[in-house]
């Protein structure tokens, strides 16, 4: 083993000193005789020490002893002691007591032999062992007076060699992270939580992170354990973007041929059943009614036109019932109803005319008379020297209950090339030209068109009466929707509880999976805001799809084109949700088609209006939009524009 030079000299010096020991004792006796008992000169002192350095050190101090205690001859004991101590430079000990192992008297000098960890002439300087190679420590070296020791960073412990460190596994203590997962790290550990949770060191538990406080959502944010969902104003035409945080417009993904004809008059615009056109004819000259027009419809029932005076006088109503023309007339208080002719609600154009002759009314379809009715009187009624006739199109000027036979006045039909009283009609033409809502789609097919801007609702009952035998169930909701969507987001069918402002049930198109936060085109079946089932759908293919929903005690199914959807809840959750639905069904609920009323966006997975064609069957009964309690005026009840042909 090699030692540093300094330590080696320190080790050798004491041995060297022991060799001079006898000589030193002899020198002390010689000094006694020459300089203590006698007064000695410098030369005599030189003879005692036999070297100049010790002599030069001794003699001035010898003179100081004389000055202090008097000459040897005075026999002052203090003098003898003073002189005897002068040659031993280790008395009194000049070395630092703490750091010195031994003091070595040298010729006119001394040497302090230091303990390990000390240095300096007097062994009063601490040696910093840490300054060289970190004192041999792996991590932390602590210097201290005359010594040093190694230690380790937090999370490590000192090995038995006193120098190296080893990692402490804090996770071995089951209490380290409490409820959270513990992960050991070099010199540390981490308490881990699932995404959406953060560790609370105070509670030693995972606590939900409220992401909504971080302002992640552009519009409405709903925090949930471990997650959050953003919602957009569906009724305002918005849906979630790809990032699931911001909102974007719901845009049509299938182009429908919604072009309108400026020379057509749409009869179904007024859901109230009030006329779309009111004309007032007045003549000085007695005149007879002549009306001719082209007409097209798929609607089986509704009013085409009314002509005459007030409800108690003389009038006629030309209507459609079960697809055939019906004429209701009242002459001088006597009412009659006549129905005849072919089924005309086939969606093709045909010419219809009503002509008042001397004593007859003649109704023609494509120039063929289908009705000829004898009448006693004229439709133009004289009043204060003028003949009056009111003519209304698409409705009557009084309540339908005051007709001879009540009828649903709403008629989704189209008129063109009209001619009233053989006169040119610039008024209606001009009005229609500037008002697109009064115009018809140029081309239509069967179905109902939802333009993405409104809904219809009905007051239907879903509770079974005890008369319904053969089933134990007390309630049932069965919906079949034939859809040809034009956009990827929207409510197809929903129930709304007005008293609670809740959405007990909804079936909707949505373009993302809310829990997986994944963009995907789906049909969602939900009770309130909870999705019960999801099913993929190719929504933008321009094809018709059939969505079937069946809910009753203990079961809920969703099918798209005959394929059953994926359940999103456990059996227990399903039962709980169905119980919620049943509670709602026991109170008044309204049935919505194509959208929802102004509910909070969090009430249901989707609040946007549906855009596209749709017919709905609820509990095996086809819903007629003309029979709704309310229908947005832009929804066409019995016609739907076709998908635009792909550009060549």
């Amino acid at each position: 083993a090699l030692l540093p030079a300094r330590e080696a000299t320190q080790f050798l010096r004491p041995r060297q000193r022991r060799a001079f020991q006898v000589f030193e004792e002899a020198k002390q006796g010689h000094l006694e005789r020459e300089c203590v008992e006698e007064l000695c000169s410098r030369e005599e002192a030189r003879e005692v020490f036999e070297n100049d350095p010790e002599t030069d050190y001794f003699y001035p101090r010898y003179l100081d002893c004389i000055n202090k205690y008097g000459s040897p001859y005075t026999k002052n004991s203090g003098f003898a002691t003073c002189v005897q101590n002068l040659p031993d430079q280790c008395t009194p000990n000049p070395c630092d007591r703490k750091g010195t192992q031994a003091c070595q008297d040298l010729m006119g000098n001394f040497f302090c032999l230091c303990k390990a960890g000390w240095g300096g002439r007097l062994c009063d300087k601490d040696v910093n062992e840490c300054s060289q190679e970190n004192g041999g420590c792996l991590q932390i070296c602590h210097n201290k007076p005359g010594s040093f020791h190694c230690s380790c960073h937090s999370g490590f412990e000192l090995s038995s060699d006193g120098r190296t460190c080893q990692d402490i596994d804090e996770c071995a203590d089951s209490e380290a992270c409490g409820e959270a997962r513990c992960k050991n790290l070099p010199g540390s550990y981490s308490c881990l939580c699932d995404e959406g949770f953060a560790y609370s060191s105070q509670e030693k538990a995972c606590r939900d992170v409220d992401e909504c406080l971080q302002g992640r959502c552009e519009q409405v944010c709903v925090n949930s354990p471990g997650s959050y969902t953003c919602h957009c104003d569906g009724r305002g035409g918005l849906k979630l973007s790809q990032d699931m945080d911001t909102c974007e417009d719901i845009l049509p993904c299938v182009p429908f041929s919604v072009a309108k004809s400026v020379k057509s008059l749409y009869l179904g615009r007024m859901f109230s059943g009030t006329p779309v056109i009111r004309l007032r004819f007045k003549r000085l000259q007695p005149t007879r009614l002549v009306a001719e027009f082209d007409f097209r419809t798929f609607d089986p029932e509704g009013i085409l036109l009314f002509a005459g005076g007030h409800q108690d006088s003389t009038w006629i109503v030309l209507a459609l019932r079960a697809g055939r023309l019906e004429l209701q007339l009242r002459y001088n208080g006597v009412g009659r109803v006549t129905s005849s002719g072919p089924v005309i609600n086939h969606g093709m154009w045909q010419t219809i005319s009503v002509e008042e002759l001397a004593r007859n009314l003649v109704i023609k379809v494509n120039r063929d008379a289908v009705m000829k009715i004898a009448v006693a009187g004229d439709l133009f009624q004289p009043e204060r020297g003028l003949y009056h006739l009111n003519l209304t199109v698409g409705g009557i000027p009084f309540h339908e209950k005051d007709l001879v036979q009540p009828i649903n006045p709403r008629l989704d039909g189209c008129m063109r090339s009209w001619n009233w009283l053989n006169g040119e009609d610039t008024t209606i033409q001009e009005t229609v030209k500037v008002n697109t809502r009064m115009q018809c789609f140029s081309v239509t097919e069967r179905g109902s068109f939802y333009p993405g801007s409104g809904f219809a609702f009905y007051s239907l009952d879903y509770m079974r009466t005890p008369l319904d035998v053969g089933t134990e169930s007390t309630w049932e909701v069965e919906v079949v929707a034939h859809i040809r969507p034009a956009a990827d987001t929207g409510v197809l069918f929903a129930l709304w509880a007005p008293d609670l402002r809740a959405v007990p049930l909804s079936v909707a198109l949505v373009d993302y999976h809310s829990t997986k936060k994944l963009k995907k085109q789906l049909v969602v079946l939900a009770v309130e805001h909870t999705a019960l089932a999801l099913m993929e759908i190719k929504v933008c293919d321009g094809q018709e799809h059939v969505v079937t929903v069946s809910l009753r005690d203990g079961e809920a199914t969703l099918e798209v084109d005959g394929t059953r959807g994926q359940s999103e809840v456990s059996a227990a959750q399903l039962q709980e949700r169905l119980a919620v639905l049943e509670r709602h069904l026991r109170s008044p609920v309204l049935t919505f088609a194509g959208g929802l009323p102004d509910v909070p966006v969090t009430s249901a997975p989707v609040t946007a209006f549906y855009r596209g064609c749709m017919t709905l069957e609820v509990n095996r009964r086809l819903l007629d939009l003309d029979e709704a309690a309310y229908k947005h005026s832009d929804i066409t009840a019995h016609s739907c524009p076709p998908v635009e042909p792909a550009a060549a």
Epitope: K282, R283, L284, Q285, R384, L421, N422
Partner: antibody, heavy 116, light 107 residues
């Protein structure tokens, strides 16, 4: 397109007679009655009456009974106004107007000046 | 006979001004009031027919209101082409009667 075209201006002496015409086109003449309206220079409009184009029966207001006659020739879809024993106060522009309870279509007017 | 009292008989206005002409009838005529505009040497032009119905091609600055016996024609912002004579006509009963007329002149 409905058109009513009246005959040109007339200058007559008091006591004379005048017959002005109103030729109708663009519609079934017999479906609408024909009205006559007088407007004296710088004055307002006065309804004189009308003629039933189906029956030829005229109707006059009180002020225009006597010297004024409405007539027809349905073969040429024309209505006429004749004023006999002209007076200075008959000086006016006479308009024909189709019966619609109110007047939408008017002739351009015929100025009759009665002056000695 | 229903007589019509039209006022004022004339008024001077600047382009852009709002003009109001009134017509009061001697009997209740419901809403069977019509309004005409006449320019020199031309036949009257129907602006508004019964039921306050603005006729096709008539600018929307023209409007009318009233029912019963009190009726008003309004020009919301007079344009240079609106300087003319205006007449009301009742078509509730025979004889049909006109108002005396209102001359709208440039100030």
């Amino acid at each position: 397109q409905v058109h009513l075209v009246q005959s040109g201006p007339e200058l007559k002496k008091p006591g004379a007679s005048v017959k002005i015409s109103c030729k109708a086109s663009g519609y079934t003449f017999t479906n609408y009655g024909m009205n006559w309206v007088k407007q004296a220079p710088g004055q307002g409009l006065k309804w004189m009456g009308w003629i039933n184009t189906n029956t030829g029966e005229p109707t006059y207001t009180e002020e225009f009974k006597g010297r004024f006659v409405f007539s027809l020739d349905t073969s040429v879809t024309t209505s006429y106004l004749q004023i006999s024993t002209l007076k200075a106060e008959d000086t006016a522009t006479y308009f024909c107007a189709r019966d619609e309870g109110w007047f939408v279509y008017w002739g351009q007017g015929t100025l009759v000046t009665v002056s000695s | 006979e229903t007589t019509l009292t039209q006022s004022p008989s004339s008024l001077s206005v600047s382009t852009g001004d709002r003009v109001t002409i009134t017509c009061i009838t001697s009997t209740d005529i419901d809403d069977d009031m019509n309004w005409y505009q006449q320019k020199p040497g031309k036949p009257p032009k129907l602006l508004i027919s019964e039921g306050n119905t603005l006729r096709p091609g008539v600018p929307s600055r023209f409007s009318s209101s009233g029912s019963g016996t009190d009726f008003t024609l309004t020009i919301s912002s007079t344009q240079p082409e609106d300087f003319a004579d205006y007449y009301c006509l009742q078509t509730d009963s025979v004889p049909l009667t006109f108002g005396q007329g209102t001359k709208v002149e440039i100030k």
